[in-house]
Interface confidence: low
């Protein structure tokens, strides 16, 4: 159904609709407004003073006829001022003007709310020429109105660099309430008050709001939009929505879930990403966050060795990126690892514990009590030592590395020997006589070579010298001993 407003010569009925100059399409499909009417159509439905000929712009032509009489002022004829219709209905309205034939190329443009409507597929302009004037009727039609079509429409025509503007035609599209603000899902602390907001608009106004909690109305009396619902507190999850009512009917907002914050679920799938002698890289999958963002996580580490004192090391880290490198661990040790995470409510339970092991590292100390002496009869240097403490080996001992440096006038020569793990002595051949031999020993595990012992020096005399005595690791603070035999 198309609602049409056009010019006719009928008298204007007194208050045919809600306001003078208005068109209520649901009741009065056709309305005309005579030129002589005492009421002028105006935006916002307010009538002008009786007797005023026109509210739009008027152009006074400067051209005169043969009799030298001036032409009458040009103005758009009056038309309907206010059209009210329901959403999705069709509407057609027009503006008309009579233009003397001396003017050529007159065009009419349509404007809405101060902006020109381009792409005139809605607009049709018809010309009705006569002897002296041409009647021009510009029609504008909308087949299915929407709320966005609400507004003030005018026609404009340019003549002699003058702009002629019609009175506005106000289109009011009425429909069910339209939400401009709906309640939003929230995560709230148990028994703590919170607010929900709902706002809807017409036309038609007013719009009244009812609140609904878990399918039951909260307020018996409606509140004018906008409405704020204060909920004093919840002990369990609830769903809220709001109903917006106006004369056209009812619109229901989306239902929003209000969740109660709780402690998180424990992390799952704790796994070992990488393991070194002194560190273990772990990752985990966070549990459910209890409707509150994770703040941080705690990694709990305890020695799995039954003889350990059972103390727990606690490492705190940020909740992201679900990855943590546990450091300061002993080499070749077994650990139980659990992860717990917290949100603003509290800590989760600990994840299932997993077992992890560090790898071997290089020994952290050198062999002890290194002693070196010359076995002149066999032309060998005998070396003895004590193995480092087991705890500081950082792995299973696989042997020792012996460095012996021979220095005499102008010669310096370093040699390396490997010795099996069971030995605590070694014998090396004399390389140079009349020289100093400097010996250092390091323990070796699969994790690498440990630090070398402090150097022990012994002088190897020329052949045929007298007795010899051992040389050993110096006491702390002493200079390197050089034993000359």
């Amino acid at each position: 159904a198309i609602t049409e407003a056009r010019e006719e010569a009928k008298p204007y009925p007194l208050f045919p609709g809600p306001f003078p100059g208005s068109l209520q399409t649901d009741h009065t499909p056709l309305l005309s407004l005579p030129h002589a009417s005492g009421y002028q159509p105006a935006l916002m439905f307010s009538p002008t003073q009786p007797g005023r000929p026109h509210t739009g712009n008027v152009a006074i032509p400067q051209v005169t006829s043969v009799e030298s009489k001036p032409l009458p002022p040009l103005a758009f004829k009056h038309t309907v001022g206010h059209i009210i219709l329901s959403e999705h209905k069709g509407v057609k309205f027009n503006c008309s003007i009579s233009v003397p034939n001396i003017y050529q190329d007159t065009t009419i443009s349509w404007w809405k709310d101060g902006k020109e409507l381009l792409g005139a597929h809605h607009a049709i302009t018809q010309f009705y020429p006569d002897d002296e004037v041409t009647a021009i009727i510009a029609s504008f039609s909308i087949t299915s109105v929407q709320r966005s079509d609400n507004g003030s429409y005018i026609c404009k025509m340019k003549i002699n660099n003058e702009e002629i503007v019609s009175d506005p035609i106000y289109i009011e599209v009425q429909g069910l309430p339209h939400f401009t603000k709906q309640p939003e899902s929230m995560n709230v602390t148990r028994n703590t008050a919170f607010n929900l907001t709902c706002q809807a608009v017409g036309p038609p106004e007013p719009v009244n709001i009812f609140w609904v909690q878990n399918s039951s109305r909260v307020n018996e009396q409606p509140e004018k939009s906008p409405s704020v619902l204060t909920v004093p507190g919840l002990t369990e999850m609830a769903v809220f929505s709001c109903e917006a009512h106006n004369d056209k009917g009812l619109t229901v907002s989306k239902g929003v879930q209000i969740n109660i914050k709780a402690i998180p679920s424990p992390p799952t799938e704790v796994s070992i990403r990488n393991s070194t002698a002194h560190s273990i890289l772990i990752s985990w999958v966070p549990g459910f966050d209890g409707y509150s963002p994770f703040r941080n996580c705690s990694i709990q580490v305890k020695e799995a060795d039954p003889l350990s004192n059972g103390s727990v090391m606690i490492f705190n880290t940020s909740a992201l990126p679900h990855l943590y490198q546990i450091k300061q661990l002993q080499a070749l040790a077994n650990y139980s690892i659990g992860v717990s995470c917290m949100n603003e409510i509290g800590w989760s339970a600990v994840s299932p514990w997993i077992l992890a092991s560090t790898t071997e590292g290089a020994p952290s100390v050198a062999p002890l009590n290194v002693t070196v002496f010359l076995n002149e009869s066999s032309d060998n240097v005998d070396i003895r030592w004590m193995k480092p403490p087991t705890k500081q080996q950082d792995g299973e001992l696989v042997g020792y590395r012996i460095s012996h440096v021979w220095q005499s006038a102008g010669i310096s020569k370093e040699l390396l020997e490997e010795v099996g793990q069971n030995g605590s002595r070694a014998r090396i051949s004399v390389q140079v006589h009349n020289a100093t031999c400097t010996v250092r020993i390091a323990a070796v595990t699969r994790g690498g070579v440990g630090p070398f012992s402090d150097p022990v020096k012994i002088f190897i005399p020329a052949h045929g010298w007298v007795d010899y005595a051992p040389s050993s690791t110096p006491a702390p603070g002493n200079a390197d001993p050089v034993l000359i035999i």
């Epitope: 070194t276 002698a277 490492f315 450091k327 300061q328 690498g448």
Partner: antibody, heavy 123, light 106 residues
């Protein structure tokens, strides 16, 4: 401005005891792990001990284990090092140092240091 | 314990020189390494952490690089205030420091 001020150093005989204090200001002391680091005269730096913000994780260097005790009082913004059975080799300037990371039970690097207090162990 | 070896032990240079100090670890430590500057009678000052990150307030002429076992501290253009002793420190295990590198005016 972050400030760490050590006190309590002095001359003590071998086998004796001493208690060092470190007064912290200019930051939220209770959020940070703290350390003691020492430096023997003319020598390099040696880490001594670590305590996490909540005092539930503590580490010691092997050289002081069983003889030194680290503690803290978050209400007083203070860090302590109780040193017993002191030896000649404990002679050093002792620095209180803040661990760079908030609430992580791992020793990292040290972003703020005090000016140090000298401990001399000698008969 | 993880051992850190700095080289050289001492170094003479002039204002405007580019200086490089190296630190070698006895085992892989990823990028868990820091560099400090210490002047006589003063506490150490943090320069670089995580091997290459510049501490806030430290001049950009200081830079760090390396990963695993070999690390470098570079001063791109020496200034008079840079003459000091420099230490590296690992923090993947219980902290240990290098023996120090003394940077002197030539």
């Amino acid at each position: 401005e972050v400030q760490l001020v050590e006190s309590g150093g002095g001359l003590v005989q071998p086998g004796g005891s001493l208690r060092l204090s470190c007064a912290a200001s200019g930051f939220t002391f209770s959020s940070y792990s703290m350390n003691w680091v020492r430096q023997a005269p003319g020598k390099g730096l040696e880490w001594v001990s670590y305590i996490i913000s909540g005092s539930d994780t503590i580490f010691y260097a092997d050289s002081v284990k069983g003889r030194f005790t680290i503690s803290r009082d978050n209400a007083k913004n203070s860090l302590y090092l109780q040193m017993n059975s002191l030896r000649d080799e404990d002679t050093a300037v002792y620095y209180c140092a803040r661990d760079e990371t908030v609430v992580r039970g791992v020793i990292n690097y040290f972003d703020y240091w005090g000016q140090g207090t000298l401990v001399t162990v000698s008969s | 314990a993880i051992q850190l070896t700095q080289s050289p032990s001492s170094l003479s240079a002039s204002v405007g020189d580019r200086v490089t100090i190296t630190c070698r670890s006895s085992q892989g430590i990823s990028s868990a390494l820091a560099w400090y500057q210490q002047k006589p009678g003063k506490a150490p000052k943090l320069l670089i952490y995580d091997a290459s990150s510049l501490e806030s307030g430290v001049p950009s002429r200081f830079s760090g690089s390396g990963s695993g076992t070999d690390f470098t501290l570079t001063i791109s253009s020496l200034q008079p205030e840079d003459f000091a002793t420099y230490y590296c420190q690992q923090f993947i295990s219980y902290p240990t420091f290098g023996q120090g590198t003394r940077l002197e005016i030539k």
